[in-house]
């Protein structure tokens, strides 16, 4: 497979969508069985990420 995608985790907190920055505003990748404070997007969920989010450049 083509190696892919920068995760580009920002250094400041408060944005939407990335690792420890997941907050109540993020509307995607949530499991219905989860509360809004424990998103399925959290890497600790153990789910496998897309090839786009696999590698840092």
């Amino acid at each position: 497979p083509i190696s892919a995608f920068a995760v580009d985790i920002p250094e400041t907190h408060g944005g939407e969508g990335y690792e420890d920055e997941i907050d109540d505003e993020y509307e995607g990748d949530w499991s219905n069985s989860s509360s809004s404070t424990s998103g399925a997007g959290d890497p600790s969920s153990g789910k496998e990420k897309s090839w786009l989010y696999t590698l840092d450049p």
Epitope: I2, A6, D8, E16, G17, L52
Partner: antibody
Framework: EVKLVESGGGLVKPGGSLKLSCAAS????????MSWVRQTPEKRLEWVAS???????YYPDSVKGRFTISRDNAGNILYLQMSSLRSEDTAMYYC??????????WGQGTSVTVSS | DIQMTQSPSSLSASLGERVSLTCRAS??????LNWLQQEPDGTIKRLIY???SLDSGVPKRFSGSRSGSDYSLTISSLESEDFVDYYC?????????FGGGTKLEIK
Amino acid sequence: EVKLVESGGGLVKPGGSLKLSCAASGFTFSSYAMSWVRQTPEKRLEWVASISRGSITYYPDSVKGRFTISRDNAGNILYLQMSSLRSEDTAMYYCAREYYYAMDYWGQGTSVTVSS
Amino acid sequence: DIQMTQSPSSLSASLGERVSLTCRASQDIGSRLNWLQQEPDGTIKRLIYATSSLDSGVPKRFSGSRSGSDYSLTISSLESEDFVDYYCLQYASSPYTFGGGTKLEIK
């Protein structure tokens, strides 16, 4: 509410060019990777291009060198510049937001027809 | 490229019936599979991600599972709005590849 609205589709002759746009709202656009996917007249879905938050780009072999994905983080707009268009590029083109588990929100699509 | 073979291509079923759609991956993709729903007007919505996680707002009659290289979308009791098109998507490796789709029709 996450919203993605594509525009710019139309009828173009083989060998011609077209630029599609996708206006994003309801989320912090710069914080997400974005992709383009197309659906052929036979209803087959095909990945077209992806762009990272830092504007690193990815393409399948079928469009590499002909299509260019780009983004305007200030204006919350995703683009797809298509050139050297072929009849097989005829499709409905969708933009989609990316997250850990691939495309989580999709636009309504814009139609591209390549015909003489 | 990873090939996703989706079956059946069309399925006729009745309201209240339980149905399952399947995608078979040509290579190992782990749990990296989504199910998408497409309305007649072209609107595409993700129903399930990571094989079995339900997206927010998706009715609980939808569920996803895996057995080896076979991935299934099950609708426990069909409702009228479920008679649309469904696609699987693998995101394990580039390029993204999709199943050929299943058209769910009312009997």
